[in-house]
């Protein structure tokens, strides 16, 4: 038995931030689980981890330097990534492992989400031209 995961095919991070929602064919209520987001076709980089446990607060962390937060729904985990760089444009995959109560369950590999990071406009806006020279 495998959990199915649905993700948006593509998201654009205009302000270097994005919300990526991972929707699961499984209710995470009262389960102990580890949801993670992985970068690259080979899922080589673990971007963010959300660890859920019946007795503790949700733990969210990145061991790879990403600025991330996570939010839990009954059948979803939403990853909020901030301070993304243009060169972090890539495909991102949701992964889920449910450990307790048994049996252990993980997911079929999803199709992934292409996150396209658009660079911030660094030019001054015409409405706010910046300080004028004396």
């Amino acid at each position: 038995n495998k959990i199915l995961v649905k993700q948006s095919p593509m998201l654009v991070a205009y302000d270097n931030a994005v919300n990526l929602s991972c929707k699961y064919s499984y209710n995470l209520f009262s389960r102990e689980f580890r949801a993670s987001l992985h970068k690259g076709l080979d899922s080589a980089v673990e971007v963010c981890v959300v660890y859920g446990n019946y007795s503790q607060q949700l733990q969210v962390y990145s061991k790879t330097g990403f600025n991330c937060d996570g939010k839990l729904g009954n059948e979803s985990v939403t990853f909020y990534l901030q301070n993304l760089y243009v060169n972090q444009t890539d495909i991102y995959f949701c992964k889920i492992e449910v450990m307790y109560p048994p049996p252990y369950l993980d997911n079929e590999k999803s199709n992934g989400t292409i996150i396209h990071v658009k660079g911030k406009h660094l030019c001054p806006s015409p409405l706010f031209p910046g300080p004028s020279k004396p």
């Epitope: 446990n53 492992e97 307790y100």
Partner: antibody, heavy 118, light 111 residues
Framework: EVQLVESGGGLVQPGGSLRLSCAAS?????????WSWIRQAPGKGLEWIGD???????YYNPSLKSRVTISRDNSKNTLYLQLNSLRAEDTAVYYC???????????WGQGTLVTVSS | DIQLTQSPSSLSASVGDRVTITCRAP??????????LHWYQQKPGKAPKLLIY???NRATGIPSRFSGSGSGTDFTLTISSLQPEDFATYYC?????????FGQGTKVEIK
């Protein structure tokens, strides 16, 4: 028939580290079960140390999490336990075991004794 | 952690006796109709051996004199007619929640 054979036990100095091996035969460690390390202090009960899942994910007892690493070498069909900053109370027989789908331990190795003493 | 309490801690019995060991959890270890409670036998100098899994299922090769029962918080291991090879220590284990925990053991000795 699944067989598990632990090795690497012996006398270790306090503050030192241990690295134990568990060679599995009769079953591939990547074939869908989970593999655990459990220990038993002399004359005491059983304590679960942690697991490595068939996916490669690891999972540890919070009481030992900061000092323990479980890994595997798929090509050798072998599991490993690394335990750091050893103290006298880590003296125990260390077992590796296979977990079934509902996390009962259905196969065990013979155990290897680790003694932490100066 | 779920701390399992076994009783008695030790008992003396004779060959042919009916022996009952109990294991109590502070909260239910059931989920969706299944009990995540298992029983092991350990002889001196040997690894534990799985006897009963999921509260009442005998593991492969375990004689029918061993049986398990119970649900929720209270579980029982019964040896219907004690044999000489049954003198050992018995442990219960829960796998409902992490960390996995074991009872403190019940030593069955010869009277």
């Amino acid at each position: 028939e699944v067989q598990l054979v632990e090795s690497g036990g012996g006398l270790v100095q306090p503050g030192g580290s241990l690295r134990l091996s568990c060679a599995a035969s009769g079953y591939s460690i990547t074939s869908g079960h989970h593999w655990s390390w459990i220990r038993q202090a002399p004359g005491k009960g059983l304590e679960w140390i942690g697991d490595i899942y068939h996916s490669g994910s690891t999972y540890y007892n919070p009481s030992l999490k900061s000092r323990v690493t479980i890994s595997r070498d798929n090509s050798k069909n072998t599991l490993y336990l690394q335990l750091n900053s050893l103290r006298a109370e880590d003296t125990a027989v260390y077992y590796c075991a296979r977990k079934d789908d509902y996390y009962a331990f259905d196969y065990w190795g013979q155990g290897t004794l680790v003694t932490v003493s100066s | 952690d779920i701390q399992l309490t076994q009783s008695p801690s030790s008992l003396s019995a004779s060959v042919g006796d009916r022996v009952t060991i109990t294991c109590r959890a502070p909260q239910s270890v059931d989920f969706h109709g299944k009990s995540f409670l298992h029983w092991y036998q350990q002889k001196p100098g040997k690894a534990p051996k799985l006897l009963i899994y999921d509260a009442s299922n005998r593991a492969t090769g375990i004689p029918s004199r061993f049986s398990g029962s119970g649900s929720g918080t209270d579980f029982t291991l019964t040896i219907s007619s004690l044999q000489p090879e049954d003198f050992a220590t018995y442990y219960c284990q829960q796998s409902y929640r992490s960390p996995i925990t074991f009872g403190q053991g019940t030593k069955v000795e010869i009277k």
